[in-house]
């Protein structure tokens, strides 16, 4: 039994996610469930460090993208939220919030100027930004 | 084999919009961002913007945005930048190239067009 | 904007010696093990053509004649032994940060 919740202020198009807690979930109430993952879109913003901390609070992380095939519906999102992808100037690599490097052909970095910090944008683009900017955010939470 | 064809040249008169044409072949368009410079006689390259025909996401060189804008029409596998309010400063050759993601980055340009010469002029 | 500054802006070379053309870029454009310079060759009324792809990698057909080297802020490309067929300006583009920023080119003459 599938029911379908429409977003249609975060994504580009209609999206069914599947809700029915038999294939998907825990998450916390009004989360958002999708192939063993649980996602909340925040609406208000804050800088990557409150976005961080803000998402910690609720025993979860910023938005790690690890699969695109597991996380496609991040495919359609609307606009630019934060994410866990922050840039080590010491040794030049792009870390999640877990320690974990960045996978190769996940996300396309796009840097603009001075920034460390990555926001989510459609079609698994990850867009630099200065961490003390305001921004929209994503936490998550893995099922398994 | 891949190519990027461009029109040889548009003249154009001041004050007027042009829309330059890349039309890809040899590949599968959606899967390489498409990227646009200008050269004007007897200097060296500019880079304009690009866009990624899968999404229609773009970036600008911010001396170039309100000046340029870049679309796609993936059915016919065709790019395409408008330059808008032309002046003489606009008078140049301009190219399209095919950007390829190398997995982190859009980090380099390997097919290039013939390039399109826009000569503004009353 | 990351700035590439080439030198030498212009370079007479005597057929088959070694040539070499420096791009400095004002910030570092290496990353995750990467450098995001490339190197192009442009002749006189054609688009410019690939000759090298991060930094040292050599571009599908381009002759062994051409390589590149370098990390971080500085990069060279040499050409060696120089032939006829060089004469040309030569890029490098960065490929790190939007604008995306080419150097202002080196033009390659024969003695």
């Known amino acids: 039994i599938w029911s379908a919740v429409f977003l249609n202020s975060l994504f580009n198009q209609e999206v069914q996610i599947p809700l029915t807690e038999s294939y998907c979930g825990p998450c916390p109430k009004n989360w958002i469930c999708y192939k063993n993952n649980c996602y909340q879109f925040f609406d208000e913003s804050k800088n990557w460090y409150e976005s961080q901390a803000s998402c910690m609070s609720q025993n979860a992380s910023l938005l790690k993208v690890y699969s695109k095939e597991d996380q496609d519906l991040l495919k359609l999102v609307k606009s630019y939220h934060w994410m866990g992808l922050v840039h080590i100037p010491t040794n030049g690599s792009w870390q999640w919030e877990d320690g974990s490097i960045l996978s190769p052909n996940l996300l396309t970095i796009i840097e603009m100027q001075k920034g460390d910090c990555a926001l989510y944008a459609s079609s698994f683009k990850g867009y630099i930004e200065n961490c003390s900017t305001p921004n929209t955010y994503i936490c998550m939470q893995r099922t398994v | 084999q891949v190519q990027l064809q461009q029109p040889g040249a548009e003249l154009v008169k001041p004050g007027a919009s042009v829309k330059l044409s890349c039309k890809a072949s040899?590949?599968?368009?959606?899967?390489?961002?498409i990227q646009w410079i200008k050269q004007r006689p007897g200097q060296g390259l500019e880079w304009i913007g690009e866009?990624?025909?899968?999404?229609?996401?773009?970036n600008y060189n911010q001396k170039f945005k309100g000046k340029a804008t870049l679309t796609v029409d993936t059915s016919s596998s065709t790019a395409y930048m408008q330059l808008s309010s032309l002046t003489s400063e606009d008078s140049a050759v301009y190219y399209c190239a095919r950007g390829v993601y190398d997995g982190y980055y859009v980090g380099y340009f390997d097919v290039w067009g013939t390039g399109t010469t826009v000569t503004v002029s009353s | 904007d990351i700035v590439l500054t080439q030198s030498p802006a212009s370079l007479a070379m005597s057929l088959g010696k070694r040539a070499t053309i420096s791009c400095r870029a004002s910030e570092s454009v290496s990353i995750m093990g990467t450098n995001l310079i490339n190197w192009y060759q442009q002749k006189l009324g054609q688009p410019p053509k690939l000759l090298i792809y991060h930094a040292s990698n050599l571009e599908t057909g381009v002759p062994a004649r051409f390589s590149g080297s370098g990390s971080r802020t500085d990069f060279t490309l040499t050409i060696d032994p120089v032939e006829e067929d060089d004469v040309a300006v030569y890029y490098c583009?960065?490929?790190?940060?939007?604008?995306?920023?080419f150097g202002g080119g080196t033009k390659l003459e024969i003695k």
């Open positions: 866009i990624d025909p899968s999404d229609i996401f773009t």
């Open positions: 040899g590949y599968t368009f959606t899967t390489y961002w």
């Open positions: 583009l960065q490929g790190r940060k939007i604008p995306r920023t």
